[in-house]
């Protein structure tokens, strides 16, 4: 025997009180698939939480987050603070990143500027709380000969003569 | 059904308090961490401050020393001491609960309040 809820369509439900005839589902619910003894709430974004998508009565609502914060975990199940670049999330709110870390997103974590010397290399161009550390060639590639390529004369102030 | 209910908004000049209250209904408040956020004219939403259980606080730098958020679980209230107000402290006021127990994040579970408006201003 063929159970008759399973001709109750998406955006109905199968209702036992009513000798299992397919009711449409009330406001502010919805059913995503045939067959279904009951309809499912539809999702509210409150707060921080702002609607992407409205419910209907076949699919749930979406949510996004409200400018200033971002979405994290499935679906954007949480709404997380941005802060600025330089900056992160901590415990007592935003927060700049410690001298040697940067961030260069509006999220996420301070990450320690690269090591340039771990690779050999020299720095290039200094790090700050926002931008990593650029590492240049290695000080064997700036020795005469080393390579093809000439790196830029050093600028030096009128009358100095070089070291 | 879960209620949160705001009060005590309203106009007071720069270098005055006021006291916020959200009144809280339909769920086991006492062991509920508690959060407020404010949203300026125009502006983003901010996280201003939260609050445990057990009572331990959190607030955004740029409040700190002139709020004061503070719990009564006989009272199922959660209230936002505000003095040394100043101009850029006017926002709609909301009151949330806090189930990350993570400063700057909600949960799509979190219950949210309908706000207060406090405007600074001479």
């Known amino acids: 025997l063929q159970d008759p809820c399973s001709n109750c369509p998406a955006g109905t439900f199968c209702d036992n009180n009513r000798n299992q005839i397919c009711s449409p589902c009330p406001p502010n619910s919805f059913s995503s698939a045939g067959g279904q003894r009951t309809c499912d709430i539809c999702r509210q974004c409150k707060g921080v939480f702002r609607t992407r998508k409205e419910c209907s009565s076949t699919s749930n609502a979406e949510c996004d987050c409200t400018p200033g914060f971002h979405c994290l975990g499935a679906g954007c199940s949480m709404c997380e603070q941005d802060c600025k670049q330089g900056q992160e999330l901590t415990k007592k709110g935003c927060k700049d990143c410690c001298f040697g870390t940067f961030n260069d997103q509006k999220r996420g974590i301070c990450r320690p500027w690269t090591n340039c010397s771990l690779d050999g290399k020299s720095v290039l161009v200094n790090g700050t709380k926002e931008r990593d550390v650029v590492c240049g060639p290695s000080p064997a590639d700036l020795s005469p000969g080393a390579s093809s390529v000439t790196p830029p004369a050093p600028a030096r102030e009128p009358g100095h003569s070089p070291q | 059904e879960v209620d949160l209910v705001e009060s005590g908004g309203g106009l007071v000049q720069p270098g005055g308090s006021l006291r916020l209250s959200c009144a809280v209904s339909?769920?086991?408040?006492?062991?509920?961490?508690m959060s407020w956020a404010r949203q300026a004219p125009g502006k983003e939403f901010e996280w201003v401050s939260s609050?445990?259980?057990?009572?331990?606080?959190y607030y955004v730098e740029s409040v700190k020393g002139r709020f004061t958020i503070s719990r009564d679980n006989a009272k199922n209230t959660v209230y936002l001491q505000m003095s040394s107000l100043r101009p850029e402290d006017t926002a709609v006021y909301y009151c949330?609960?806090?189930?990350?127990?993570?400063?700057?994040?909600?949960?799509?579970?979190?219950?949210w309040g309908q706000g207060t408006l406090v405007t600074v201003s001479s």
């Open positions: 949330a609960t806090w189930k990350t127990l993570r400063v700057g994040v909600w949960d799509e579970s979190d219950y």
């Open positions: 339909g769920f086991t408040f006492s062991s509920s961490a």
């Open positions: 609050i445990y259980s057990s009572g331990k606080t």
